[in-house]
């Protein structure tokens, strides 16, 4: 996260970090407890998922294994539409205070809606320089049309735009994945944007997760 | 130091392949693409395809589709590009090199390799 | 596919001169247009990315301009070791990502 601030602990419950080995490859979302939302772009052969802790390489935290990885069918490696993954733990997660699920959304929120966007991705760019704290920042969702002055044809329909005028804070390498979070709901997982990051004016881009619940109920439900 | 590092030259006969390799060091490999780039003499720059080095997703350039392919091996940090069938046209220097961005979409070339001679002759 | 045309494919210039290489693009391609030199026996070096941005450790002498089609790399005052091949590439349409035919630019 670029420009953000440190955030306040235990506010993230549903945050997880994808690592590989030790090292964080992505961000995600715990959806449920044998499940974790994340980008499809994010994919790897197996993870080591962290959750309930703040700090990234906590030996407190909990980490289980997964193996198993959805992809969203119609994910483009090409146009990079549909950027969207479910991953099922290999194990339940313990819930308690620090670990919960994130609410799904009921309805796709409007632009000018504040949100917020956190991670354990780089906090500078090009030179990346990763925090041991989960970082946030708080963006407001942009409407497609505005977004599409910046970015034109490369905005799919199922894209999100966040950011603030005239501000660098935006997401960056290792926040792939990760929750963008507007009124108590997840509308949005990091998707990609203009490097370096934090070019003022230049909205980060998510998938758009109102778009995508009857996959993400039914990917759960056939991979029980 | 941050740096890709690519095999020696090859001479090849035409309907051989060749495999070049790519070793990355100073940064994170799982973190970025590689792409292949060949120049053949006098020539200019020609993309051949690129690969995610984590997840091993792969685009190719649609004239070279069926007759190569690209792999990485995360734990050395290696990438490779296997050509097939090799023609005389495809005497080249072949170049890796990485892509700058973040999250789904890159943007530039910012590391290359120092290119690798592949030629092919009877 | 994007074709990307470069122009002139050679040029002739002095130490000192100002030196203007054009890009043009098939259809739009926005600003994301980058530029590259390459010697001989070497393999390409970033000078521009998103159309105008110096990467970092590029003399300042080198720019970049234009968006949507038309695009420029200016030197500003060239020097003995500018002289090289440039390229340009698109990343707004890809894959394929497609570069131009180059530029050579040699001493007079």
């Known amino acids: 996260i670029i420009d953000g601030y440190k955030c306040k602990e235990g506010s993230h419950p549903w945050q997880v970090a994808l690592l590989k080995g030790n090292q964080l490859h992505c961000g995600g979302v715990l959806v449920d407890k044998y499940w974790v939302l994340t980008a499809a772009h994010c994919k790897m052969g197996q993870y080591q998922v962290q959750l309930g802790s703040d700090k990234i390489g906590d030996q407190s935290a909990q980490k289980i294994k997964a193996t198993k990885s959805f992809r969203h069918p119609g994910y483009s490696t090409k146009t990079h539409v549909n950027d969207i993954m479910l991953v099922r733990l290999d194990e339940p997660v313990k819930m308690s205070s620090k670990v919960e699920a994130v609410q799904l959304p009921e309805h796709c929120e409007p632009p000018g809606t504040s949100c917020t966007v956190s991670g354990w991705g780089t906090t500078t760019s090009p030179d990346v320089t990763f925090p041991s704290d989960l970082m946030c920042s708080d963006v407001k969702l942009i409407s497609s049309r505005e977004c599409k002055k910046v970015y034109k044809d490369l905005l799919g329909k199922t894209m999100l735009c966040a950011g603030i005028p005239d501000s660098k804070t935006n997401t960056c390498n290792g926040d792939s994945g990760g929750p963008l979070v507007c009124n108590d709901t997840l509308q949005g997982l990091v998707s990609w944007g203009t490097y370096p990051c934090g070019q003022p004016n230049d909205p980060g881009v998510y998938t758009q997760v109102c778009k995508y619940k009857r996959w993400v109920m039914e990917t759960m439900k056939t991979h029980r | 130091q941050v740096q890709l590092v690519q095999s020696g030259a090859e001479v090849k006969k035409p309907g051989a392949s060749v495999k070049v390799s790519c070793k990355a060091s100073g940064y994170t490999f799982t973190s970025e693409g590689i792409h292949w780039v060949r120049q053949a003499p006098g020539q200019g720059l020609e993309w051949m395809g690129s690969i995610s080095a984590s997840s091993g997703d792969t685009n190719y350039a649609q004239k070279l589709q069926g007759r190569v392919t690209m792999t990485t091996d995360t734990s050395t940090s290696t990438a490779y590009m296997e050509l097939r069938s090799l023609r005389s046209d495809d005497t080249a220097v072949y170049y890796c090199?990485?892509?700058?961005?973040?999250?789904?979409?890159?943007?530039?070339?910012?590391?290359w390799g120092q290119g690798t001679m592949v030629t092919v002759s009877s | 596919d994007i074709q990307m045309t470069q122009s002139p494919s050679s040029l002739s210039a002095s130490v000192g001169d100002r030196v203007t290489i054009t890009c043009r693009a098939s259809q739009s391609i926005s600003s994301y247009l980058n530029w590259y030199q390459q010697k001989p026996g070497k393999a390409p070096k970033l000078l521009i990315y998103?159309?105008?941005s110096l990467q970092s450790g590029v003399p300042s002498r080198f720019s970049g301009s234009g968006s949507g089609t038309d695009f420029t790399l200016t030197i500003s005052s060239l020097q003995p070791e500018d002289f090289a091949t440039y390229y340009c590439?698109?990343?707004?349409?890809?894959?394929?990502?497609?570069f131009g035919g180059g530029t050579k630019v040699e001493i007079k």
């Open positions: 998103g159309a105008s």
């Open positions: 590439d698109q990343w707004y349409s890809t894959p394929p990502i497609t």
């Open positions: 090199a990485r892509s700058a961005g973040y999250g789904a979409r890159h943007w530039y070339f910012d590391l």
